[in-house]
């Protein structure tokens, strides 16, 4: 189980709810968006496999000063079972490939929707 929302959270949030919340937030920040997200910041690409939430957080946590993804980072914190800090890298990063935050978010979103449809919430 994961806990989202910081001190305001009433209790543990089921993974399916957390995943829905993440999907909805990623849609919010990308809908009809053509301007570069986070001023075109680049992040490490990740393998969209097991451990993806932590890997995604490890990539996005290195983007600073971008309010558009603050809530995404917070939701990912709730979905990742261990503490993640800037500069941390897991084997799930494709270390030789950097992509724009906007593309990273869109790729992540499409994959999360696929997982949700397949009922893979963890």
């Amino acid at each position: 189980l994961t806990c989202l929302g910081g001190f305001a959270s009433p209790g543990p949030v089921p993974p399916s709810t957390a995943l829905r919340e993440l999907i909805e937030e990623l849609v919010n920040i990308t809908q009809n968006q053509k301007a570069p997200l986070c001023n075109g910041s680049m992040v490490w690409s990740i393998n969209l496999t097991a451990g993806m939430y932590c890997a995604a957080l490890e990539s996005l946590i290195n983007v600073s000063g971008c309010s558009a993804i603050y809530r995404t980072q917070r939701i990912l914190h709730g979905l990742c079972p261990h503490k993640v800090s800037a500069g941390q890298f897991s084997s799930l990063h494709v270390r030789d490939t950097k992509i724009e935050v906007a593309q990273f978010v869109k790729d992540l979103l499409l994959h999360l929707k696929k997982l949700f449809r397949e009922g893979q919430f963890n």
């Epitope: 999907i23 909805e24 849609v27 990308t30 809908q31 009809n32 869109k106």
Partner: antibody, heavy 126, light 108 residues
Amino acid sequence: EVQLVESGGGLVKPGGSLRLSCAASGFTFSNAWMSWVRQAPGKGLEWVGRIRSEIDGGTTNYAAPVKGRFTISRDDSKNTLYLQMNSLKTEDTAVYYCATDQVGAYYGDYYGMDVWGQGTLVTVSS
Amino acid sequence: SYELTQPPSVSVSPGQTARITCSGDALPEKYAYWYQQKSGQAPVLVIYEDSKRPSGIPERFSGSSSGTMATLTISGAQVEDEADYYCHSTDSSGNHGVFGGGTKLTVL
């Protein structure tokens, strides 16, 4: 065949209510964001509101003139979109179209595809 | 509330290039969509995401966007292109749609 068919239009008195339906076929309705757009006689197109697909949150947004009076909903099991219109005003008189929402096209499986209904006329008059 | 501004009318001779503009403060960051509507018919999408053309739309239709202005260009306009054209986009949140007032294209 990909199509949308609206129904439920007609004559209603000011202050009255009406529910429009839009039956979808030929595409994966549950993946689509859907919009309602209206056109008053001899006037331009006016965006009424939209509903996201369920997987994208199912959230609704409305244009200022209809917010609080109109409600958009969907029944994916019936491939049907609805527009519940309450507290109708004479200025709501228009042809109402349902359409796939292009902003949501990236998230669905209808990217670059455009589907509109034939429109249904709603007349608000005493 | 957010608005998109279009010229009420544009006239060209057959074979000429017609340009219809659409201005809006959010257009630098939000995509524009263009619809063609002929009398008594439902609108038809002719350009999406600023410059992409749906299948079945003739190549003479193209779109571009720069700053707060989106432009629909019809190269070698034909009589059958005579119609009302509407630009469509969203406010800066992406949550609320808006249409321009429409431009009547006359090809004579």
